[in-house]
């Protein structure tokens, strides 16, 4: 039952990300930024299940990429970062298995390239922000909160998928 697995994985990832905070977010209020989270891409009602899973996959993949950089390694406590990355990697494997399974069941799987592009552009904005802020501790703190928000949205999409089953 992938959606259930993904939900638990996301919850574990959120808890790890919550534990990763190193500085008080209240010292970073002025650094907060609207990254334009594409919330409409997490509305499971408009997608086939395969499409929704591919959006989830892109979200997790981009998060994994973001936290696998050298700059990220310097910003976070290593053991928590490794656990977080492992959790994301496991979710990617599960989602890939699920896509293969779903493609066999759906007649004409449509690729939702616009949605995937929206997710990629969202992460480009995050990366640009980090670059402009020179990967400062506050910039990473703002990004950590943003990624928690996006993971929460993907959890909600997953819950809607489970209701469709």
């Amino acid at each position: 039952d992938l959606p259930q697995t993904h939900s638990l994985g996301n919850r574990r990832a959120l808890i790890l990300l919550a534990q990763m905070g190193r500085i008080s977010p209240f010292s970073c209020l002025k650094d907060r930024h609207d990254f334009g989270l594409p919330q409409e891409e997490f509305d499971g009602n408009q997608f086939q299940k395969t499409q929704a899973i591919s959006v989830l996959h892109e979200m997790i993949q981009q998060t994994f990429n973001l936290f696998s950089t050298e700059d990220s390694s310097a910003a976070w406590e290593q053991s928590l970062l490794e656990k977080f990355s492992t959790e994301l990697y496991q979710q990617l494997n599960n989602l890939e298995a699920c896509v293969i399974q779903e493609v066999g069941m759906e007649e004409t799987p449509l690729m939702n390239e616009d949605s995937i592009l929206a997710v990629r552009k969202y992460f480009q904005r995050i990366t640009l922000y980090l670059t402009e802020k020179k990967y400062s501790p506050c910039a990473w703190e703002v990004v950590r909160a943003e990624i928690m928000r996006s993971l929460s949205f993907s959890t909600n999409l997953q819950k809607r998928l489970r209701r469709k089953d």
């Epitope: 959120l14 209240f26 209020l29 907060r32």
Partner: antibody
Framework: QVQLQESGTVLARPGASVKMSCKAS????????MHWVKQRPGQGLEWIGV????????TYNQKFKDKAKLTAVTSANTAYMELSSLTNEDSAVYFC?????????????WGQGTTVTVSS | DIVLTQSPASLAVSLGQRATISCRAS??????????MHWYQQKPGQTPKLLIY???NLESGVPARFSGSGSGTDFTLNIHPVEEEDAATYYC?????????FGSGTKLEIK
């Protein structure tokens, strides 16, 4: 479902201290900031401060820095606020509230409130 | 501290009409695309309830007759059409900087 259960009414003498509790259930207590808010009878709301139960990190409204002390015991899923050197001005209802939407700092779930009455 | 001035202090609106509540901040609470202003409803003897966050986002489960707008220093809460159950005190709250503060409240009475 999410619930915040606060301790009951407290009657205290001027100069004394009181410690109130807020027991959380229905969510991961250690991963949400918890705010405390004061409301005097017939008046508005005042933000006292916030605590992160996961590591005990606190941030205070400077006005309450020497008045309130926020703590949390994760094993009991409970947040505490201690008020010291009580005066009549401290007579109020005190709410614990869960932080919502990460760094937007809104408050979604509220405890029912602890009423503190300071009287000699 | 940022002072939030709500107006009017009280208003009476007929059933089905529009209620408009204003909240003015002494300093901008908007940065990089977000306005850190939120609205709560408090009924007598109850705890406050979040209605709107980030100036215009409707909280889940809140009826669509509630709407928020504004940026910088001037914000508005609209209720239309007003229903009996909307009789309450409404508070704005900012989270633009420390300390977070609330407005003094607007009491809405339904005629």
């Amino acid at each position: 479902q999410v619930q915040l259960q606060e301790s009951g009414t407290v009657l205290a003498r001027p100069g004394a201290s009181v410690k109130m509790s807020c027991k959380a259930s229905g969510y991961s207590f250690t991963t949400y900031w918890m705010h405390w808010v004061k409301q005097r009878p017939g008046q508005g709301l005042e933000w006292i401060g916030v605590i992160y139960p996961g590591n005990g990190d606190t941030t205070y409204n400077q006005k309450f820095k020497d008045k309130a002390k926020l703590t949390a015991v994760t094993s009991a899923n409970t947040a505490y606020m201690e008020l010291s050197s009580l005066t009549n001005e401290d007579s109020a209802v005190y709410f614990c509230t869960r932080n919502y939407k990460y760094d937007y700092y809104t408050m979604d779930y509220w405890g029912q409130g602890t009423t503190v009455t300071v009287s000699s | 501290d940022i002072v939030l001035t709500q107006s009017p202090a009280s208003l009476a609106v007929s059933l089905g009409q529009r209620a408009t509540i204003s909240c003015r901040a002494s300093k901008s609470v908007s940065t990089s695309g977000h306005s850190y202003m939120h609205w709560y409803q408090q009924k007598p003897g109850q705890t406050p309830k979040l209605l709107i966050y980030l100036a215009s986002n409707l909280e889940s489960g809140v009826p669509a007759r509630f709407s928020g707008s504004g940026s910088g220093t001037d914000f508005t809460l609209n209720i239309h059409p007003v229903e009996e159950e909307d009789a309450a005190t409404y508070y704005c709250q900012h989270s633009g900087e420390l300390p977070f503060t609330f407005g003094s409240g607007t009491k809405l009475e339904i005629k």
